[in-house]
């Protein structure tokens, strides 16, 4: 058993039929010695008396809020949560496996630049009685500070009969050095509590590997005289690291016909303009990627040819 926060404890259980469970001793936080009784949750049934209560925790029915009283007055509470281990593996019932980029991916994180700021998100089908707490650091043995905000519900989607909820959190490395080579990864730890079930999820990454620039901005077309060609121009996104001479992007320019089946013409360039042929009813899209490190491409910025 260990303390998650004040008056909240996590009991780690091997979860299999007829498992013996864990013996837990609760102590009432009071100078009183006599006349103390214990109850669980809303029930008025007295479970025991005395300053300590010894219980055998085997299942969710044994978890919950234990309260010690004296003469009708509440003295203290202890909330017991369960962390299940099945076949040697901690349960992952609360979050959905996003399966991207690989199986057992519960947390996904992205950064728009090298400032040390990043966003992580996760999915669940659970809508109520759910809380998340996020901690992060750079390195684990001698951790350097990363500050994370509160996790918030960021999207709700319908998937067949069920809804799916996306939560996200923003974190900022306290002493980020954008130009430095990373040697220790960022560690992100999410504590999830649904009713009386505790689970924890972790992700470890280098900022350079989760970079995904915003799409190029100010995408414009300039027709070239006496030609079907146009000059496409764009700018670096505002959120990208500066100076651009050091934090450089490369770009992919695509001409796409109205039909998805039509052949796509693609041009790769390090410049912020390109000359392409603009077909009728086509659109021109541009996306960006770090020039010197193959992390994710940005989403497309698009304009119609007409």
């Amino acid at each position: 058993i260990w303390e998650l926060k004040k008056d909240v404890y996590v009991v780690e259980l091997d979860w299999y039929p007829d498992a013996p469970g864990e013996m837990v001793v609760l102590t009432c936080d009071t100078p009183e010695e006599d006349g103390i009784t214990w109850t669980l949750d809303q029930s008025s049934e007295v479970l025991g008396s005395g300053k300590t209560l010894t219980i055998q925790v085997k299942e969710f029915g044994d978890a919950g809020q234990y309260t010690c009283h004296k003469g009708g007055e509440v003295l203290s509470h202890s909330l017991l949560l369960l962390h299940k281990k099945e076949d040697g593996i901690w349960s992952t019932d609360i979050l959905k496996d996003q399966k991207e980029p690989k199986n057992k991916t519960f947390l996904r994180c992205e950064a728009k630049n090298y400032s040390g700021r990043f966003t992580c998100w996760w999915l669940t089908t659970i809508s109520t009685d759910l809380t998340f707490s996020v901690k992060s650091s750079r390195g684990s043995s001698d951790p350097q500070g990363v500050t994370c905000g509160a996790a918030t519900l960021s999207a709700e989607r319908v998937r067949g009969d069920n809804k799916e909820y996306e939560y996200s959190v923003e974190c900022q490395e306290d002493s980020a050095c954008p130009a430095a080579e990373e040697s220790l990864p960022i560690e992100v730890m999410v504590d999830a509590v649904h009713k009386l079930k505790y689970e924890n999820y972790t992700s470890s990454f280098f900022i350079r590997d989760i970079i995904k620039p915003d799409p190029p901005k100010n995408l414009q077309l300039k027709p070239l005289k006496n030609s079907r060609q146009v000059e496409v121009s764009w700018e670096y996104p505002d959120t990208w690291s500066t100076p651009h001479s050091y934090f450089s992007l490369t770009f992919c320019v695509q001409v796409q016909g109205k039909s998805k089946r039509e052949k796509k013409d693609r041009v790769f360039t390090d410049k912020t303009s390109a000359t392409v042929i603009c077909r009728k009813n086509a659109s021109i899209s541009v996306r960006a990627q770090d020039r010197y490190y193959s992390s994710s491409w940005s989403e497309w910025a698009s304009v119609p040819c007409s």
Partner: antibody, heavy 116, light 108 residues
């Protein structure tokens, strides 16, 4: 205690609001549920409204019902009833432990008949 | 999400024992309640958290199970136990909520 009212005979498509009036406890501390039971059939949950006022609905509801509350009442609005909505409608109070809860105080129910 | 109750009806003698099963289509941990309903009356809570007896309910009623399989057992049957019994999952309003189809208990 909990008591439903507003059940009556209505024609299909006529909006109807059922009201659940509570006494002896505060709605700001408990989840409330609306459940219906067609004649001779089982219990079917429609939706719940949390202590904080958030409403959650069964997947089949699709906007046909809306739950809201004041300090002492919980309303169930039937936007466009059909004959299939003929049932006794129950309101019940949760235990106070969770938003998705079990229910230990029930009203006697109010009968809604939808017929042309 | 579905809760399947079996059997749909059962007949037993006074003093006998009845077992009703409730199966969830996904794990709901121990978030299951049992209700008793008599004709013309609202449901009455018997058991919550799969096995905890509600206030004032006789100990002849007992519940067990976790995950997807749950059981309500009524022992030393009395005539007053003739009713329809429902299980209810309260795991989550979106990911596991609702009532079983009911089991009618006839006491002879």
């Amino acid at each position: 205690s909990v008591e439903e009212s507003g059940g009556r005979l209505v024609t299909p498509g006529t909006p109807l609001t059922l009201t659940c009036t509570v006494s002896g406890f505060s709605l700001s501390s408990y989840t409330m549920i609306w459940v219906r039971q067609a004649p001779g059939e089982g219990l079917e949950w429609i939706g719940i409204i949390s202590a904080g006022g958030s409403a959650y609905y069964a997947s089949w509801v699709n906007g046909r019902f809306t739950i809201s509350k004041t300090s002492t009442t919980v309303d169930l609005k039937m936007t466009s009833p059909t004959t299939g909505d003929t049932a006794t409608y129950f309101c019940a109070r949760g235990s106070g432990t969770y938003t998705s809860d079990y229910f230990n105080i029930w009203g006697p129910g109010t009968l809604v008949t939808v017929s042309s | 999400f579905e809760l399947t109750q079996t059997p749909s009806s059962v007949e037993a003698a006074v003093g006998g024992t009845v077992t009703i099963k409730c199966q969830a289509s996904q794990s709901i941990d121990s978030w299951l309640a049992w209700y008793q309903q008599k004709p013309g009356q609202p449901p009455k809570l018997l058991i919550y958290s799969a096995s905890k007896l509600a206030t004032g309910v006789p100990s002849r009623f007992s519940g067990s199970g976790s995950g997807t399989q749950f059981t309500l057992t009524i022992s030393d049957l009395e005539c007053a136990d003739a009713a329809t019994y429902y299980c209810q999952s309260y795991y989550d309003a979106n990911a596991g909520y609702g009532f079983g189809g009911g089991t009618k208990v006839v006491v002879v």
